[in-house]
């Protein structure tokens, strides 16, 4: 009957709404987890990069004038 059909349709709509919400929540949870993981990755990489940066700042490169000369003195003397 039409009443039964309407009741079944209403039930199915309710079920689909609930299922959709459950799926969305699950997907949202997964996405949040992935975002959290990505964020953790960024933070970790950031700290790693920061550590490298500070080590470079702390251990300053030798000045260009304080590196090996183009012509070594022994060569210059020999010449």
């Amino acid at each position: 009957s039409e009443a039964e059909d309407a009741s079944l349709l209403s039930f199915m709509q309710g079920y689909m709404k609930h299922a959709t919400k459950t799926a969305k929540d699950a997907l949202s949870s997964v996405q949040e987890s992935q975002v959290a993981q990505q964020a953790r990755g960024w933070v970790t990489d950031g700290f790693s990069s920061l550590k490298d940066y500070w080590s470079t700042v702390k251990d300053k490169f030798s000045e260009f004038w304080d590196l090996d000369p183009e012509v070594r003195p022994t060569s210059a003397v020999a010449a």
Partner: antibody
């Protein structure tokens, strides 16, 4: 050839001036360094100076106490050491940048 | 500061045999100019250090081809083939890439 002089016994807080006479190469075209060695122990870079003397570099423990300088007309490198401490006791070597050539060293002893 | 860790610290060798010394660094040593300022020295008893190798693998003037340097990154090696009695002494690795320049603690090579 590099010949150091000026080492000796000095009391804590005292001063010394080391000299390094260079010969056999064009002194003014090479940056120079001082390296020290506690007798029987390892080596430690102390300071470096640019060919013209315009640029200098020091290890942290001697900054503000030691001054590196040079006189290219006299082919001589210097290290003025003030406020000397017991831990500055070492043989001080004059070295050409690149560590290719070393002097024989001069001993500095800081003791009361 | 960059830490240079040498091994072994003592190395007994029979004349004619080969010897190998390792130097591990706490950080890579490539300068911003693309070169690696890594060195090996030999200090014989009562003498100043003498340079054997510069920029990882280049032999210094007058150094026999029995001495060879290799390595990259943080691992470097000095190999001495056909060891002679005159090779006895303390071997040091060092770098000049960053301030302060630092040296290894030394490896004593003794002839058996």
């Amino acid at each position: 050839q590099l010949v150091e002089s000026g080492g000796g016994l000095v009391q804590p807080g005292g001063s010394l001036r080391l000299s390094c006479a260079a010969s056999g190469f064009t002194f003014g075209t090479y940056s120079m360094r001082w390296v020290r060695q506690v007798p029987g122990k390892g080596l430690e870079w102390v300071s470096s100076i640019h060919t013209e003397g315009g640029g200098t570099a020091y290890r942290d423990s001697v900054k503000g106490r030691f001054t590196i300088s040079r006189d290219n007309a006299k082919n001589t490198l210097y290290l003025q050491m003030n406020s000397l401490r017991a831990e500055d006791t070492a043989i001080y070597y004059c070295v050409i940048a690149g560590y290719s050539d070393w002097g024989q060293g001069t001993l500095v002893t800081v003791s009361s | 500061d960059i830490v240079m860790t040498q091994s072994p610290l003592s190395l007994p060798v029979t004349p004619g045999e080969s010897a190998s010394i390792s130097c591990k660094t706490s950080q890579g040593l490539v300068h911003s100019d693309g070169k690696t300022y890594f060195y090996w020295f030999l200090q014989k008893p009562g003498q100043s250090p003498q340079q054997l190798i510069y920029q990882v693998s280049n032999r210094a003037s007058g150094v026999p081809d029995r001495f060879s340097g290799s390595g990259s990154g943080t691992d470097f090696t000095l190999k001495i083939s056909r060891v002679k009695a005159e090779d006895a002494g303390v071997y040091y690795c060092a770098h000049g890439t960053y301030y302060p320049h630092t040296f290894g603690q030394g490896t004593r090579l003794e002839i058996k």
